[in-house]
Amino acid sequence: LSLEGSRTLTVCPGSVQPLSSQTLRASSSAGTDPQLLLYRVVRGPQLGRLFHAQQDSTGEALVNFTQAEVYAGNILYEHEMPTEPFWEAHDTLELQLSSPPARDVAATLAVAVSFEAACPQRPSHLWKNKGLWVPEGQRAKITMAALDASNLLASVPSPQRLEHDVLFQVTQFPSRGQLLVSEEPLHAGQPHFLQSQLAAGQLVYAHGGGGTQQDGFHFRAHLQGPAGATVAGPQTSEAFAITVRDVNERPPQPQASVPLRITRGSRAPISRAQLSVVDPDSAPGEIEYEVQRAPHNGFLSLVGGGPGPVTHFTQADVDSGRLAFVANGSSVAGVFQLSMSDGASPPLPMSLAVDILPSAIEVQLQAPLEVPQALGRSSLSQQQLRVVSDREEPEAAYRLIQGPKYGHLLVGGRPASAFSQLQIDQGEVVFAFTNFSSSHDHFRVLALARGVNASAVVNITVRALLHVWAGGPWPQGATLRLDPTILDAGELANRTGSVPHFRLLEGPRHGRVVRVPRARTEPGGSQLVEQFTQQDLEDGRLGLEVGRPEGRAPSPTGDSLTLELWAQGVPPAVASLDFATEPYNAARPYSVALLSVPEATRMEAGKPESSTPTGEPGPMASSPVPAVAKGGFLGFLEANMFS
């Protein structure tokens, strides 16, 4: 077993963070299924808790989890906010990884909880920056319940903390009111106030009246040392929001809702994108939602609440990321029917749509891409790439993650590394060879559909432009002529303007391909051939010696030749010539030109002299020659008989 990943987790204060494969990634030399890589929590976290997304609120500490659950993002660390402010805190988890029969591996996961980090769940870097609600034309104290930089002070070691303060410098003043410290207005010449003044209740905002538009101020907060000296340490620039409450109550206005998209069996927070209202005179905690009707694909839950579904929650729960949707195994979309009220206006109906994404998609590869040899290119179709999940995914998009080695993909005639299912279905995605040295290729794509991805490899083969003989059996022990009636790449020759050539890759198991001397005057016997051309076939220079299977009585059998066919300007292609053989039967008409027949047959005919050392054909076999072969075979005899 081996452990990879950073083994460090950075968490925003008070938030939930999933463990990921970047953090914790186990593997085994045996390639064990991630579901069988088991972690045991030896010592749990001190500053929060570890829980499973689907059993989050049981209150029981998580004891075991698998690598597969980490990959799925189901193992969550929740930081629990302490009562005492802090700037940075460190937590550890001690884990034991096991997957018998391998030896256990101990691991420590370090957790850093820091206000330094940029946190989407918590836009402020301060202990508190909650904003202020003030009635129109009135004044309100800004207390430490609304604005508190104690966490900046917490970065200073406690013995020196009393000598330090936090200086707030106002960089943009309120536009509809005034800030006062000890009843003295702040202005460009005196833009500062201190955390200690805030703590003493000396900071006040006075609204100038004339409407309930939002107000606020921007500030920079940093540590101040003894005697007002600036010291190195954490600092932040933020805005403090001031909401002016209308004395005349107005009903909340629901905002347009974006459906929640979630994979089945998982958990996702509900955000303001799904549920939000505009209500200038109600605080988020005053906006209450009630579930009137829930869908069957899951339920709403509150972090820190009970294990079951919640039926009541507030806008503050949504804004803080505490409200989550827990999906069950259903793949059907659903809608929550809700009612919403600020407590002073009649309830308003609202809805929350939940779209269930597939937990996984699959790229279906029904066949390799076959490229016609003379064209050197072919369009992809659904046979090569089609995405399915719990339904077909016509909206799938593909991205090349490893390109083909001997060609490229084109969309609309130009090289492209990304394309859609629609472009495939319309025949716009083409693979074309650019390097004509291989008869096959492959590329890897990443498919993306409904937020989920999967990868697949598309194999490419070249279909030879070759006409191959497909007739009856050939006689064992005979030599037959290999000519265009058996193998013909003439069309490839015409299409490429070149002489195709063949390379013997494999076979036959019983027999061999030989070059036949043109005449008796040519020296030597039959030469073994590994390469030949279309011209050789047309010239009748080649023979196939059909062997007998060794070590058994003569009987019909199958054999084959595997060839690679090359021509100029096109990719090579592999083709095979499959044929059946049988013991030679002198009475049978063979539909191929026989250059020689088995020795025994000649001896029986009383003509031993016909077996020539040059491999020249002996007298015509007693088998009648069919018309198809007569021209070739008799022509061969006539051309050579008197040479």
């Epitope: 050197g376 609309g412 090289p415 492209a416 590394s417 074309a432 650019t434 303007g497």
Partner: antibody
């Protein structure tokens, strides 16, 4: 739209290595297909040198293959050309291009 | 390598003329042909890709045709800004190769 900008020394001594970098903006070098280097000798036609693809694979013109290396830095969205053992015959304007769009070209003179 | 031969190597024409430039490949290139325009001291600009597809922003007076080994670039009505050198380039087989160029001059 994709923009390409070549950078590198305009003068290289014979037998040394010519090094140029192409910075791509308006698109990622991991998504465009081919990132090519092409050169043009003074008053002459265009000669393709080689390419690097979105997945980092290379191909070079056989006439220059023994001297050429094209590499990339995805973090900077750049790809580079190195041409070793240069001679006066390598004096040319060097372009980087994805074929749809080309850099403005940089003249490299090989001279002692 | 596939050789690309352009003809003519130069031509003189007047504004408003119809101009045709041909490009012949030493073997079939399956329509994988680009046409570029280059002005002195400037980088080439793509006009046409895949034999006949007009690149974005290119005026419709430019058109391309051809198949197999023979391809043509046509400028239906020559404009003053069209006086330049034109190159064809094949991307059917590696190495990519260019034609030697056709210079279009003012008569």
């Amino acid at each position: 739209q994709v923009q390409l900008q070549e950078s590198g020394p305009g003068l290289v001594k014979p037998s040394q290595t010519l090094s140029l970098t192409c910075t791509v903006s308006g698109g990622s070098i991991t998504s465009g297909y081919y990132w090519n280097w092409i050169r043009q000798h003074p008053g002459k036609g265009l000669e393709w040198i080689g390419y690097i693809t979105y997945d980092g694979s290379n191909n070079y013109n056989p006439s220059l293959k023994s001297r050429v290396t094209i590499s990339r830095d995805t973090s900077k969205n750049q790809f580079s050309l190195k041409l070793s053992s240069v001679t006066a015959a390598d004096t040319a304007v060097y372009y980087c291009a994805d074929f749809d769009y080309w850099g403005q070209g940089t003249l490299v003179t090989v001279s002692s | 390598d596939i050789q690309m031969t352009q003809s003519p190597s130069s031509l003189s024409a007047s504004v408003g003329d119809r101009v045709t430039i041909t490009c012949r490949a030493s073997q079939g290139i399956r329509n994988y042909l680009n046409w570029y325009q280059q002005k002195p001291g400037k980088a080439p600009k793509l006009l046409i890709y895949y034999t006949s597809s007009l690149h974005s922003g290119v005026p419709s007076r430019f058109s391309g045709s051809g198949s197999g080994t023979d391809y043509t670039l046509t400028i239906s009505s020559l404009q003053p800004e069209d006086f330049a050198t034109y190159y064809c380039q094949q991307y059917s087989a590696l190495p990519w190769t260019f034609g030697q160029g056709t210079k279009v001059e003012i008569k």
